[in-house]
Interface confidence: low
């Protein structure tokens, strides 16, 4: 398909015009053709910021213990999350772990397991703002 950008008709090679001296926009990367950018291929590669990269960043494939929260677009990487019943702390690169099945004796669950955190338990007598 022809892209119209800056009132320039560009043919089937799908060049996005980028004036010399500008970065390529998100969703594209620097072309070998001076003053031009190549679009990333949906589901294959992406760039999420203005850039001068030789190639789009490869889309991440979710691991076997994860599911896809949102697919890879030309401007955003695949978002993966742990499958139901498992979690991984936000800043951790570890494998998804099984959620705890319940709270220890004398404690009550105040937060369910999410893909990003285990269940949360508090002592029955503690007033932490949750309605228990």
């Amino acid at each position: 398909a022809t892209i119209k950008l800056h009132d320039q008709s560009i043919g089937t090679q799908q060049w996005e015009h980028s004036p010399l001296g500008e970065l390529c926009p998100p969703g594209s990367h620097r072309s070998e053709r001076p003053g031009a950018c190549n679009r990333c291929t949906e589901g294959v590669g992406y760039t999420n910021a203005s850039n001068n990269l030789f190639a789009c960043l490869p889309c991440t494939a979710c691991k076997s213990d994860e599911e896809e929260r949102s697919p890879c677009t030309t401007t955003r990487n695949t978002a993966c999350q742990c499958k139901p019943g498992t979690f991984r702390n936000d800043n951790s690169a570890e494998m998804c772990r099984k959620c705890s099945t319940g709270c220890p004796r004398g404690m009550v669950k105040v937060k369910d397991c999410t893909p990003w955190s285990d269940i949360e338990c508090v002592h029955k007598e503690s007033g932490n703002g949750h309605n228990i």
Partner: antibody, heavy 116, light 111 residues
Framework: QVQLQESGPGLVKPSETLSLTCTVS????????WSWVRQSPGKGLEWIGS???????NYNPSLKSRVTMTIDKSKKQFPLKIDSVTAADTAMYYC??????????WGQGTLVTVSS | SYVLTQPPSASGTPGQRVTISCAGS????????VNWYQQLPATAPKLLIY???QRPSGVPDRFSGSKSGTSASLAISGLQSEDEADYYC???????????FGGGTKLTVLG
């Protein structure tokens, strides 16, 4: 019009460090990759390495252990250092701007002689 | 030794057509685009042809480039005395992860 200017000492002693700087004018340093290329007297061109605006480098494998490239966006400069030089490093050194995989603008070059 | 192979010299008379070859392999020319640079005596290289066959603005259409398989060629038609220079081919080499050049071809315009 983009202009590149190489600067640095023209004479370096063997085993010392060669230090050159490329200064960019007439354009942004943040939008491109930048390269160093050298040419020994009477010989062809040899790529030394490239650096992008974020400081990510890519070096010629044959020189990698001795080469360091950095970028200073505020000064619009990208320096080159080559350690432990020998007479074989005597060459004309060029800096160049990369557009994708094309070096479209080159500096005029600076001759570096390695001699005691 | 250079990764890309060029003839060391070429010559022609004014008005003639001259071709300079550049031979590589599947890891460089075979999978990447080729650029050609002209280096006039005592000057820096100048981009002459990019992406196999594209001319930057200001380069006369007497200069043309082509690529086939693992080889590339630069053709100069209507040879002029000011074309006397060294010509280099260059491309990316996937196995080396960097730029590679040919050894250069010295073009002499006779007469």
């Amino acid at each position: 019009q983009v202009q590149l200017q190489e600067s640095g000492p023209g004479l370096v002693k063997p085993s010392e460090t060669l230090s050159l700087t490329c200064t960019v004018s007439g354009g942004s340093i943040s939008d491109y990759y930048w390269s160093w290329v050298r040419q020994s007297p009477g010989k062809g061109l040899e790529w030394i390495g490239s650096i992008d605006y974020a400081g990510s480098t890519n070096y010629n494998p044959s020189l990698k252990s001795r080469v360091t490239m950095t970028i200073d966006k505020s000064k619009k400069q990208f320096p080159l250092k080559i350690d432990s030089v020998t007479a074989a490093d005597t060459a004309m050194y060029y800096c160049a701007r990369q557009l994708g995989r094309i070096s479209d603008y080159w500096g005029q070059g600076t001759l570096v002689t390695v001699s005691s | 030794s250079y990764v890309l192979t060029q003839p060391p010299s070429a010559s022609g008379t004014p008005g003639q057509r001259v071709t300079i070859s550049c031979a590589g392999s599947s890891s460089n020319i075979g999978g990447n685009t080729v650029n050609w640079y002209q280096q006039l005596p005592a000057t820096a290289p100048k981009l002459l042809i990019y992406s196999n066959n594209q001319r930057p603005s200001g380069v006369p259409d007497r200069f043309s480039g082509s690529k086939s398989g693992t080889s590339a060629s630069l053709a100069i038609s209507g040879l002029q005395s000011e074309d006397e220079a060294d010509y280099y081919c260059a491309t990316w080499d996937d196995s080396r992860g960097g730029w590679v050049f040919g050894g250069g071809t010295k073009l002499t315009v006779l007469g």
